[in-house]
Structure formats: structure tokens, C-alpha cells
């Protein structure tokens, strides 16, 4: 079989949900010494980056200007060292937001509940969409989907203090084109002291894997680069629709 280099890691910088007309940045983390990186969109070549000097950095950033529905979809990347190409990265789903309208999010029985109570979120949007999405702040990869003509229900079942946090919803016009986000709804779940101490509130910063971890080379990094790259590929968690 033809020899290939380990697959790179593709990430969205800051977030994979990009407001229309704003810039998206995707990072492709490959290997020190890579002379070329290619970004592919829906299977076709989209952009090419040739870092100079190539041996000093283990990846590149691809800027995607003026985000719109035509540039939302599935991205992947590959890289080359000499004449040897890598395997293709996992797919990254890039979503355009702030399309058309803004939904309304509400919660029943209310935003303040007791641990064990059943809670349902309702997302309403009057324009033509049938898919709705609910996201918890700091957990933007864990998207819940629900369907409805104008309104969708998101039953949470009996909640625990782990459900505490801020929620937003979107209407979806297709898998990669979402509405403006709703205003956030903060769910407060009260429980006994033991439960509360075990379930701190979620961080409000972006998901930790939505960060570009490109590094400049040092002697030690060079020695560890291949081992580290293989390990990261093995452990990397990736979101799929």
C-alpha cells in the first residue's frame, strides 16, 4: 500500500458557528516540515497554503472571508512533506448563522426549577424552517435537534444540577445555515448541597477544542512532533452532524 503521513487535525478557531459576512478561520495542524497544506470544501480544493519557512511551524490557518451559505458545509485538510501526502483529516462542519430571522426560546415550567423536575424548552420561529437546534453555552458541540413547523419541543426529562446554564436555540434552513440565535435562557436548577458541589456551572468560554494550537518548532518539539501528532489524532474528539 502507498505510504502516507498521519492525518492532520482540523479545527475552527473560536467557533464553527460563524455569523454571515464575518470571517471564519480554520486551522490545519499537520507536521513540522510540511511544505504545503490544502483545504478542501465539499470534496473540492478550496485553498492552498505553503508556509515559509516550512520547518518552523506545525500547521497553518486558513481564513474564509465573507461567510455565507455557499461556504458553509464540510471542510477537510491535507498536508505534504516533500512528495509525500498525508491522509485526509476528519471532516469539520462549518455553519453560517444570523440568516433571516431570530427565534424565541422559552422553558416550561420556568427558568428556576428543582432537581428532579421535568423541563421542556420550546423554540419558536415563524419563518419557513422545520428543524430547530438547542445549544448549551460552553457545550456548542452538543447540539440537540428537534422538528416542528413553527415550534419545536426539547424535553430534558428530570433535570439535575448538571443541566444548569445558559441555553440558546436556532432555526435551521439546512444543516449548515442557521438563523440568528435566540436570546439566552438561563436555567437554574436547585438541588441538595451534595449534588450542587458535584455539578459546577458550565464555563462560558468557547469549547476547549475550538482553539488553534499551532506551535513554532524547538529542538524538543522536533523530536516529539511525530509522537505527539499521532497521539492527538488518536484522542481528538470531533463533531459530526
Amino acid at each position: 500500500p502507498k505510504q502516507t503521513l498521519p492525518k492532520p487535525i482540523i479545527r475552527a478557531e473560536s467557533t464553527y458557528m460563524v455569523p454571515k459576512e464575518k470571517q471564519a478561520t480554520l486551522c490545519c495542524q499537520g507536521s513540522y516540515g510540511a511544505v504545503e497544506y490544502q483545504l478542501h470544501f465539499e470534496g473540492s480544493l478550496f485553498a492552498v497554503e505553503r508556509p515559509k519557512p516550512p520547518e518552523r511551524i506545525n500547521g497553518v490557518k486558513f481564513h474564509i472571508p465573507d461567510m455565507n451559505s455557499r461556504k458553509a458545509g464540510r471542510y477537510s485538510c491535507i498536508y505534504r512533506v516533500g512528495e509525500l501526502w498525508s491522509e485526509r483529516s476528519d471532516l469539520l462542519d462549518l455553519v453560517v448563522t444570523e440568516m433571516y430571522d431570530t427565534p424565541t426560546l422559552s422553558v416550561h415550567p420556568g427558568p428556576e426549577v428543582t432537581s428532579g423536575e421535568k423541563v421542556t424548552f420550546y423554540c419558536r420561529l415563524d419563518t419557513a424552517t422545520s428543524m430547530f437546534l438547542l445549544l448549551k453555552e460552553g457545550r456548542s458541540r452538543d447540539v440537540q435537534r428537534s422538528y416542528g413547523k413553527v415550534q419545536a419541543e426539547f424535553p430534558m426529562g428530570p433535570v439535575t444540577t448538571a443541566h444548569r446554564g445558559s441555553y440558546r436555540c436556532f432555526g435551521s434552513y439546512n444543516n449548515y445555515a442557521w438563523s440568528f440565535p435566540s436570546e439566552p435562557v438561563k436555567l437554574l436548577v436547585t438541588g441538595d448541597i451534595e449534588n450542587t458541589s458535584l455539578a459546577p456551572t458550565d464555563p462560558t468560554f468557547p469549547d476547549s477544542w475550538d482553539t488553534c494550537l499551532l506551535t513554532r518548532e524547538t529542538g524538543l518539539q522536533k523530536d516529539l512532533a511525530l509522537w505527539d501528532h499521532t497521539a492527538q489524532n488518536h484522542h481528538h474528539h470531533h463533531h459530526h452532524h
Epitope: 478550496f46 485553498a47 497554503e49 505553503r50 474564509i64 472571508p65 461556504k71
Partner: nanobody
């Protein structure tokens, strides 16, 4: 806002050469990656060549490699496409395009997908005859 105007097209015999020019107005052109695309009769638009804003990085479609050369002169706000060894199948309208000026671009990035480009010229006709 960037306006692009192509020139230099015309009728040429197979095996001949042409040099296309893309004149840009707008202060940001010198910081924008750009490219040439073409659309032949009854065909889809296809990528020809791309160049980074610095001119330090170029990329070509396989069928143009070795025959076409893309370059730019940022001081003159102009990009060029030198086309040699022209073939009948090179007959097309040639368009230059520049990406949107919403981002600071790496000096070595090029874009090969038409969807990356915000600004387009009106095109110049190249006809290759036998």
C-alpha cells in the same frame, strides 16, 4: 470596494501567446489574494491560476501548469496572466477575481474555489483558432 477590469484578450492562432491584464481600483487590492478563472462555450466556470497578495505563492490548474504564468504588480494595482502554447480548448472568457477585504491574509495563501472570491471583472474573450 474593489473594481476589476480585464484586457488583453483577442484572437490568436494555436501555439501562440497572449498576455491578459487585470486592472484594479481600490486601495486594498495589494493585500488581497486573486485569481483567474475561465468559462468556455457551453462549459462551467473553471479555475485557471491563483496568486497570493504578496506574489510569493502561486497555484495552477493541472492543464495550465507550465504554459500559463500568473503574476502581479501591487504598485500598479495590476495582475497578469501570461498564456503560452495556446490550444483550441483554451478558448473562453477569462475573468479575474479578488477575495473580499474583510480579513488580513497570509502572504502565502491562495484560493482556488470561486466561492472564495467577492470581486469579479466582466471578463475578456480569448479565441484560439487553428
Amino acid at each position: 470596494q474593489v473594481q476589476l477590469v480585464e484586457s488583453g484578450g483577442g484572437l490568436v492562432q494555436a501555439g501562440g501567446s497572449l498576455r491578459l491584464l487585470c486592472a484594479a481600483s481600490g486601495r486594498t487590492f495589494s493585500r488581497l489574494p486573486m485569481a483567474w478563472f475561465r468559462q468556455g462555450p457551453g462549459k462551467d466556470r473553471e479555475f485557471v491560476a491563483a496568486i497570493s497578495w504578496s506574489g510569493g505563492s502561486t497555484y495552477y490548474a493541472d492543464s495550465m501548469k507550465g504554459r500559463f504564468t500568473i503574476s502581479r504588480d501591487n504598485a500598479k494595482n495590476t495582475a497578469y496572466l501570461q498564456m503560452n502554447s495556446l490550444r483550441l480548448e483554451d478558448t473562453a472568457v477569462y475573468y479575474c477575481a479578488a477575495v473580499g477585504d474583510s480579513a488580513p491574509y497570509s502572504a502565502t495563501i491562495v484560493y482556488t474555489d470561486a466561492r472564495a472570491y467577492a470581486y469579479w471583472g466582466q471578463g475578456t474573450q480569448v479565441t484560439v483558432s487553428s
